[in-house]
Amino acid sequence: DAEFRHDSGYEVHHQKLVFFAEDVGSNKGAIIGLMVGGVV
């Protein structure tokens, strides 16, 4: 017998979280950036 469909035709790959911080001028504050990638 043929198999019934049981996947949605796409995959979710491991997500990569990349953090970075930069000094901002004289106030020494930090900007935190978050990038989420890898979802096809």
Partner: antibody, heavy 124, light 112 residues
Framework: QVTLKESGPGILKPSQTLSLTCSFS??????????VGWIRQPSGKGLEWLAH???????YYNPSLKSQLTISKDTSRNQVFLKITSVDTADTATYYC????????????????WGQGTTLTVSS | DVLMTQTPLSLPVSLGDQASISCRSS???????????LEWYLQKPGQSPKLLIY???NRFSGVPDRFSGSGSGTDFTLKISRVEAEDLGVYYC?????????FGAGTKLELK
């Protein structure tokens, strides 16, 4: 909330074509992973799966009836249709539509919502 | 086709009893993705079927914990630990791994 409701002619004569409509709300067939199937049940008997259609128009049929069956959808109207050609008295049954979705993210791979059913009598 | 054989076809019980329903498939219903799509549905008179158990042993949302499913390969069981009046009806096992999708003939749970 999710609801499904079947509608049909009620009575047909042998050799006629059955046209069924499943009107639903609370979900959309434009959503990836979503699907709707048809199941029937002769009075006092068991359940028989007929066909299933997915959001991407992929279709599955019961091979024993495939030559008679056509499943289709109108995504914008939230409706799924089933046609059965050349009906016979053996097609007398209650016809149900039910939602079954597939997703890699959530475990929804089952018939979680069913309509109330529409009854067909085939009689000459 | 995958034939789903349920036993017994009729199960008379008293309220508070434990009930056990067996379902055997004519071939393995393990899908190529590793999952076993074995489900149990309850149909009460005049109503549409309602999902109880999916993937052999997972209780659907809102299903009381007196219902439990077990098994593997071709041999599956539904157990009700203490039957209540609202549990009476016809229980169907179902396989969703192979086309055509198929149901068992049903087991009628009724009062003695």
């Amino acid at each position: 909330q999710v609801t499904l409701k079947e509608s049909g002619p009620g009575i047909l004569k042998p050799s006629q074509t059955l046209s069924l409509t499943c009107s639903f709300s609370g979900f959309s067939l434009s959503t990836s992973g979503m699907g709707v199937g048809w199941i029937r049940q002769p009075s006092g008997k068991g359940l028989e799966w007929l066909a299933h259609i997915w959001w991407d128009d992929d279709k599955y049929y019961n091979p024993s009836l495939k030559s008679q069956l056509t499943i289709s959808k109108d995504t914008s109207r939230n409706q799924v249709f089933l046609k059965i050609t050349s009906v016979d008295t053996a097609d007398t049954a209650t016809y149900y539509c039910a939602r079954r979705s597939i997703s890699t993210l959530v475990p929804e791979d089952y018939f979680d919502y069913w309509g109330q059913g529409t009854t067909l009598t085939v009689s000459s | 086709d995958v034939l789903m054989t349920q036993t017994p076809l009729s199960l008379p019980v008293s309220l508070g009893d434990q009930a056990s329903i067996s379902c055997r498939s004519s071939q393995s219903i393990v899908h190529s993705n590793g999952n076993t799509y074995l489900e149990w549905y309850l149909q009460k008179p005049g109503q549409s079927p309602k999902l109880l158990i999916y993937k052999v042993s997972n209780r659907f949302s809102g299903v009381p914990d007196r219902f439990s499913g077990s098994g593997s390969g071709t041999d599956f069981t539904l157990k009700i630990s203490r039957v209540e009046a609202e549990d009476l009806g016809v229980y169907y096992c179902f396989q969703g791994s192979h086309v055509p999708l198929t149901f068992g003939a049903g087991t009628k749970l009724e009062l003695k």
